[in-house]
Amino acid sequence: MAVTACQGLGFVVSLIGIAGIIAATCMDQWSTQDLYNNPVTAVFNYQGLWRSCVRESSGFTECRGYFTLLGLPAMLQAVRALMIVGIVLGAIGLLVSIFALKCIRIGSMEDSAKANMTLTSGIMFIVSGLCAIAGVSVFANMLVTNFWMSTANMYTGMGGMVQTVQTRYTFGAALFVGWVAGGLTLIGGVMMCIACRGLAPEETNYKAVSYHASGHSVAYKPGGFKASTGFGSNTKNKKIYDGGARTEDEVQSYPSKHDYV
């Protein structure tokens, strides 16, 4: 019961996490800037992985996609790749984990197969979560680096003077969504891996029985079998085969349905 709950909860947490990673990847608010000291209009600029947007005080918003791949910073490309890898791995993990759920019966799938699938999906969720966290962290680092590099940077370009505008910058909402979503996916993956241990079938019950026939310690009496089964004269169930039949665990546990020997 606890295993099923752990597995189910892991699946749900991972599902929420992956939905969050997808949402963060699609969001435009990865970085946000307020542009001040503007004589025309107050402008709010925000950028995502796929496009850059400008919203004016009038409410007008214009977004432009990053149509070129070559002109984009390598770091942005890396973040895109990490987020996409995270989504793909997460999606595959979800697909695998659906079939691995203990509460879902598919044909005559054995517990060992379900355990393996649960572990596989768990590992996929962990990697997916790590990809998302890494992607968001790389982007955040890029923002901080750009901020310090651009401080008081003024130079003369070919077409006149170019001056970096110092704006108050904040991490966009997408960064926080990405961090939380990555964390949830990671937690969900760990839960799936924990559930896998409980799902794995226990060691075989066909335990080897070793008979140690040491002359002085074993007394072979007629009716010994009867005594051992409780049908003969030995009604008090005294140990007759004192040093005799022992399991490898020293003492055999309660009989199970597999104990044919």
Epitope: S31, L35, V43, V54, F60, R64, N146, T164
Partner: nanobody, 119 residues
Framework: QVQLQESGGGLVQPGGSLRLSCAAS????????MGWYRQAPGKQRELVAG???????NYGDSVKGRFTISRDNAKNTVYLQMNSLKPEDTAVYYC??????????????WGQGTLVTVS
């Protein structure tokens, strides 16, 4: 790197017209604001007109009703139509653009200026 290419300046008689244009090129994500400033000899640089992406405009007091600013967002170009020119409009006209040129990078770029002489 962002470059500005200004054109349209020259000599014109009082009451005449001129059309200035300024095209931005290079690493550009967005251009929230484009505008024109001018600086007459011995005077401070002043705003002539500015226009936002959405078409919000702002004009300097001395040019209201005579000058019209417009822009082509697709071409990253701003235009200044100057009508009823006066001798006091003589100045070097500078193109000014606010460019989002990268992630968390906003540049204010100034053109080299084009001379307008009303005489």
């Amino acid at each position: 790197q962002v470059q500005l290419q200004e054109s349209g300046g020259g000599l014109v008689q009082p009451g005449g017209s001129l059309r200035l244009s300024c095209a931005a090129s290079g690493s550009i994500f967005n251009i929230p604001v484009m505008g024109w400033y001018r600086q007459a000899p011995g005077k401070q640089r002043e705003l002539v007109a500015g226009i936002s992406t959405g078409g919000t405009t702002n004009y300097g007091d001395s040019v209201k009703g005579r000058f019209t600013i417009s822009r082509d967002n697709a071409k990253n170009t701003v235009y200044l139509q100057m009508n009823s020119l006066k001798p006091e409009d003589t100045a070097v006209y500078y193109c000014n653009v606010l460019v989002v040129s990268g992630i968390g990078s906003t540049l204010e770029v100034w053109g080299q200026g084009t001379l307008v002489t009303v005489s």
